[in-house]
Amino acid sequence: AMHVAQPAVVLASSRGIASFVCEYASPGKATEVRVTVLRQADSQVTEVCAATYMMGNELTFLDDSICTGTSSGNQVNLTIQGLRAMDTGLYICKVELMYPPPYYLGIGNGTQIYVIDPEPCPDSDF
């Protein structure tokens, strides 16, 4: 299996945005790569978003996706937005080298994303 590295922990910003790098050790010269972000929480795994891209080109997520990303060589910079405290969990990066054959699959160990909802602003007396 292909090795995929990602940070162990990331703290989302106060605006609910978390970014992390997913890096894969490509055994071949892939031209088309598929990246999927999976969320694991309470032993349930769900797909957060997925994108296919040509090496050297931008990642294209669906228009309504909460993910955006850029690629550089064997690194993918992923950003997940609109996160709330309830979205805290382990976010796993799955990389598939689709074409040309052979097919390679790599799954990272996951990035624990912590999301803290911002405190509401106190009423002001001014």
Partner: antibody, heavy 118, light 107 residues
Framework: EVQLVESGGGLVKPGGSLRLSCAAS????????MAWVRQAPGKGLEWVAF????????YYADTETGRFTISRDNAKNSLYLQMNSLRAEDTAVYYC???????????WGQGTTVTVSS | DIQMTQSPSSLSASVGDRVTITCRAS??????LNWYQQKPGKVPKLLIY???RLHSGVPSRFSGSGSGTDFTLTISSLQPEDVATYYC?????????FGGGTKVEIK
């Protein structure tokens, strides 16, 4: 039910051109790579060309590179094969096939016959 | 290109017989070996992919085995409807290549 229906075959003179079409239904076309495979009369199967689901990747058999062009229109659920500079040895039944991992062709159309003869 | 060699090119067996077809690749193709069935005058159909996984709707009398360069398609009990030409195909590297086919007939 997965259905693939080819059209566009016919008789053409050497050096001529043809455009084959394949209409797909019964599955989400934009999720799958597609291939063209041909079979000369009384012969075996020969892979011709492949296009990935979003058309990012396109590949051809060595003999067809430069003469054939594979393309797709996901909005129309259609696959195409533009064949130029046709030769007698291109005479065959041309099948369009859906390609799923692991690079197997899991569903095939009924085929369209291309005859190159003067 | 990876060459795929099938043997025998044709065989004749009785209904109920165990039939074995072999396919040899010119280099290691890992798990990327698929088998197709083409009945006379019909369209090819995927039988087995990833060496041994049956495609949907394929009867359990068909099985595949092997690794690396040597692979086998087995029909455990030949039925009249199994009369066809069988092709192996490698998906390990482009161009994808097929074996020459094995024609199976009933005695």
């Amino acid at each position: 039910e997965v259905q693939l229906v080819e059209s566009g075959g016919g008789l053409v003179k050497p050096g001529g051109s043809l455009r084959l079409s394949c209409a797909a239904s019964g599955f989400t076309f934009s999720d799958y790579g597609m291939a063209w495979v041909r079979q000369a009369p009384g012969k075996g199967l020969e892979w011709v060309a492949f296009i990935s689901n979003l058309a990012y990747s396109v590949y051809y058999a060595d003999t067809e590179t430069g003469r054939f062009t594979i393309s797709r229109d996901n909005a129309k659920n259609s696959l195409y094969l533009q064949m130029n500079s046709l030769r007698a040895e291109d005479t065959a039944v041309y099948y369009c096939a859906r390609s799923g991992l692991p690079y197997a062709m899991d569903y095939w159309g009924q085929g369209t016959t291309v005859t190159v003869s003067s | 290109d990876i060459q795929m060699t099938q043997s025998p090119s044709s065989l004749s067996a009785s209904v109920g017989d165990r039939v074995t077809i072999t396919c040899r690749a010119s280099q290691d193709i890992s798990n990327y070996l698929n088998w197709y069935q083409q009945k006379p005058g019909k369209v090819p159909k995927l039988l087995i992919y990833y060496i041994s996984r049956l495609h949907s709707g394929v009867p359990s009398r068909f099985s595949g085995s092997g690794s690396g360069t040597d692979f086998t398609l087995t029909i455990s009990s030949l039925q009249p409807e199994d009369v066809a030409t069988y092709y192996c195909q490698q998906g390990r590297m482009l161009p994808w290549t097929f074996g020459g086919g094995t024609k199976v007939e009933i005695k």
